[in-house]
């Protein structure tokens, strides 16, 4: 039930990786707004995003607080010209959001090959440490810092010359690999949540090669 | 719950080819590494190769490189293993496993395969 | 390639005793090992991963230890139903490699 000139959300979806975390909403507003509260199942409610005509609602300063609790949101919906109108049974329509652990579920992003270095017959390949949302004493924490050994990166490298692929992997964000010498090797990562039993894998990060434009070694 | 059933083994003579299929259910492939492992008569494991199949990459034990082919379908929840030019010593038990990056919790029961002229 | 020794390839003992296989890398696997009991005509089951951690619903009598190339597996008191062939596996490079197997027996 509800007013005769809104209509309540529906769709409400979580966009999140590496913890920068969006709900997303239907429909886009005709004559209403919206305004989305969050809380986690033992907390108090929080409005954000207020009287807004915006199907999202970046709720990444709430769900960093603690990503290890599971939020709920819900989506109220109000008459454009008279947001203290409310429905049927006294209070605005709104609908609640699928539940949500930031630690469980958020997408792994990208991740990218920081750096590559031989000497000799091995090659020491780094896998930037992205910076999060995450805080703790008032410092971002990098995604190692809040994963852990919960998160690994496994390596794809092969022979430029070759289509034969060799992997390895590392619960550090450092790759020590032997190679042979006077060939060039591209390199690809991935990172996994061995825990998880969904969103455990990241898209590959971009390849890189040796002996290309880039250098051996890269900051 | 979490199942692998292997199947299309049987009896092969040496030189022709043959596909194994491995049935996933409780699960999605594509969230996974997956692999196959062999194990010949009297004999111990050996590793075959695995499969992203999220996105195709595979990577193999040199020497099944070129006859041996990991593939996947993941609409079908499938892993497959082509196994050309086959010879007497790849008489085996082929089991299909799920890895989670720090282990392989998953098996399935095996499938055996016996080249015989 | 990462050679896996293991050893011995076949143990006799009795109900009681305490039971060790090592596995010997030829280079650092970085405690990227497993331990697997197989039994005749079935899969192989995890016992032992990340070198050290205890699969889940696994007695507490196995245990693993070991870092570098050196690992070692115990059964601190062997029970009849453990009789079965024992493998460790490196899974920190490819190609990922098996042990050679220990066959236990009871005496």
């Known amino acids: 039930s509800g007013t005769t000139n809104t209509v309540a959300a529906y769709n409400l979806t979580w966009k999140s990786t590496n913890f920068k975390t969006i709900l997303e909403w239907e429909p886009k507003p005709v004559n209403q707004v919206y305004t989305v509260q969050i809380s986690t199942k033992s907390g108090d409610w929080k409005s954000k995003c207020f009287y807004t005509t915006d199907t999202e609602c970046d709720l990444t300063d709430e769900i960093v607080k603690d990503v290890k609790q599971t939020y709920l949101a819900r989506v109220f919906s109000y008459p454009a010209g008279n947001v203290e109108s409310t429905g049927s049974a006294g209070e605005p329509l709104y609908e609640n959001s699928p539940e949500f652990t930031p630690y469980l579920e958020t997408n792994l992003g990208q991740p990218t090959i920081q750096s590559f270095e031989q000497v000799g017959t091995k090659v020491n390949v780094t896998v930037e440490d992205e910076r999060t949302l995450v805080r703790k004493n008032g410092t971002f924490l990098t995604l190692r810092q809040v994963f852990g050994k919960d998160l690994i990166y496994t390596l794809y490298y092969w022979k430029s010359s070759s289509s034969g692929k060799k992997t390895a992997k590392t619960n550090t964000n450092e790759f020590l690999i032997d190679v042979d010498k006077g060939e060039n090797y591209c390199f690809s990562v991935q990172a996994v949540i061995p825990s998880r039993t969904v969103n455990r894998k990241s898209t590959d990060s971009p390849v890189e090669c040796m002996g290309q434009e880039k250098g051996e070694f890269r900051e | 719950q979490v199942q692998l059933v292997e199947s299309g083994g049987g009896v092969v003579q040496p030189g022709r080819s043959l596909r194994l299929s491995c049935k996933a259910s409780g699960f999605n492939i594509k969230d996974y590494y997956m692999h196959w492992v062999r194990q010949a008569p009297g004999k111990g494991l050996e590793w075959i190769g695995l499969?992203?199949?999220?996105?195709?990459?595979?990577i193999y034990d040199p020497k099944f490189q070129g006859r041996f082919t990991i593939s996947a379908d993941n609409s079908k929840n499938t892993l497959f293993l082509q196994m050309d030019s086959l010879r007497p010593e790849d008489t085996a038990v082929y089991y299909c496993a799920r890895d989670n990056s720090y282990y392989f919790d998953y098996w399935g029961q095996g499938t055996p395969v016996t080249v015989s002229s | 390639d990462i050679q896996m020794t293991q050893s011995p390839s076949s143990l006799s003992a009795s109900v009681g005793d305490r039971v060790t296989i090592t596995c010997k890398a030829s280079?650092?696997?970085?405690?990227?090992l497993n331990w697997y009991q197989q039994k005749p005509g079935k899969a192989p089951k995890l016992l032992i991963y990340y070198a050290t951690s205890l699969a889940d619903g696994v007695p507490s009598r196995f245990s693993g230890s070991g870092s570098g190339t050196d690992y070692t597996f115990t059964i601190s008191s062997l029970q009849p139903e453990d009789i079965a062939t024992y493998y460790c596996?490196?899974?920190?490079?490819?190609?990922?490699?098996f042990g050679q197997g220990t066959k236990l027996e009871i005496t």
């Open positions: 499969i992203d199949p999220e996105n195709g990459n595979t």
């Open positions: 280079q650092d696997i970085r405690k990227y």
């Open positions: 596996l490196q899974h920190g490079e490819s190609p990922y490699t």
